[in-house]
Amino acid sequence: FERTRSLQDPCSNCPAGTFCDNNRNQICSPCPPNSFSSAGGQRTCDICRQCKGVFRTRKECSSTSNAECDCTPGFHCLGAGCSMCEQDCKQGQELTKKGCKDCCFGTFNDQKRGICRPWTNCSLDGKSVLVNGTKERDVVCGPSPADLSPGASSVTPPAPAREPGHSPQ
């Protein structure tokens, strides 16, 4: 008769949100609160992820899907499914073991996360520097000197920084 049963696997008819209950003849039972089964035919329900501390809830857990977390302000997600929260830094900085540090001269970071990256070397493409780089912004490359019209000159390359880690202003 029509119990949650098929010829192959008696659990195959248990819908998402339920589990195949070994305690009572493999009848489908609803997942308990704070647990879920995202697919049919499951023999157990998975415990819902809890977004605690630096994590905050982006999507509540339901009987058929896990909770989803993101990070509280001042932090950003890392890893699959936001498995970690990492501290934000300011633009022009990178996170080190000792905290947020300014980008070294010749490097930049235009985001609140990630590492400082070297300025583009315009000369590798036969171009010149149109706009100087800063710790927050990459240089802007312009046309090569040969492409300039007569009488025009390229922008002067940046002078050495007075302080390490800072570009000239």
Epitope: P15, I27, P30
Partner: antibody, heavy 123, light 108 residues
Framework: QVQLQESGPGLVKPSETLSLTCTVS????????WSWIRQPPGKGLEWIGR???????NYNPSLKSRVTMSVDTSKNQFSLKLSSVTAADTAVYYC?????????????????WGQGTTVTVSS | EIVMTQSPATLSLTPGERATLSCRAS???????LSWFQQIPGQAPRLLIY???TRATGIPARFSGSGSGTDFTLTISSLQPEDFAVYYC?????????FGQGTKVEIK
């Protein structure tokens, strides 16, 4: 707290289809099975079947060929249809929340019932 | 299906007496899935006991349940006027869920 309310015609003609709706208030219909039970006059309780919020069903074999259950989660309602009725289907029809587990896997029986609605099959 | 048989069909007692109601299953039922209901005439059944021995919310301590396997018992230690009603056992261990035929506790 969760409350259930049955509604539908009190009188159905023989050979026609009995249709009842149970409205869930004070809580969500989601994540539970929901049962229908009936009680003929002066007799005991008979389980008709149950439905999960996804629409998955289990029916009593004695009624299976005539029973259809459905659910409308947007309205927090579930429904019973019983076709080809006869006088033997005259009864008080109850809806109830089916058994469920708490977080510690303690099992609770049919803990919430509607007050019941009387259906008479007569021409 | 699992057949639930209750005895006696009727129990005639006076207020203050002890009531012992029996429920027997045609095959073994895990006690987690055995419930007792009380039904007062004109009202819906009310869950009294679940898991064979756990009182539902708001149920007085004079009601107790026991048993395992195929034999289960509901005991009312001292009958109160409001306890005269019909009592049903029910299993949801295996489909289809089944009820006993009921025991009527009446005033002697």
């Amino acid at each position: 707290q969760v409350q259930l309310q049955e509604s539908g015609p009190g009188l159905v003609k023989p050979s026609e289809t009995l249709s009842l709706t149970c409205t869930v208030s004070g809580g969500s219909i989601s994540s539970y099975y929901w049962s229908w039970i009936r009680q003929p006059p002066g007799k005991g309780l008979e389980w008709i079947g149950r439905i999960y919020t996804s629409g998955s069903t289990n029916y009593n074999p004695s009624l299976k060929s005539r029973v259809t259950m459905s659910v409308d989660t947007s309205k927090n309602q579930f429904s019973l249809k019983l076709s080809s009725v006869t006088a033997a289907d005259t009864a008080v029809y109850y809806c109830a929340r089916d058994g469920w587990y708490d977080e510690d896997y303690n099992y609770y029986g049919m803990d919430v019932w509607g007050q019941g609605t009387t259906v008479t099959v007569s021409s | 299906e699992i057949v639930m048989t209750q005895s006696p069909a009727t129990l005639s007692l006076t207020p203050g007496e002890r009531a012992t109601l029996s429920c027997r299953a045609s095959q073994s039922v895990s006690s987690n899935y055995l419930s007792w209901f009380q039904q007062i005439p004109g009202q819906a059944p009310r869950l009294l006991i679940y898991g064979a021995s756990t009182r539902a919310t708001g149920i007085p301590a004079r009601f107790s349940g026991s048993g395992s396997g195929t034999d289960f018992t509901l005991t009312i230690s001292s009958l109160q006027p409001e306890d005269f009603a019909v009592y049903y056992c029910q299993q949801d261990y295996d489909l289809p869920w089944t009820f006993g035929q009921g025991t009527k506790v009446e005033i002697k």
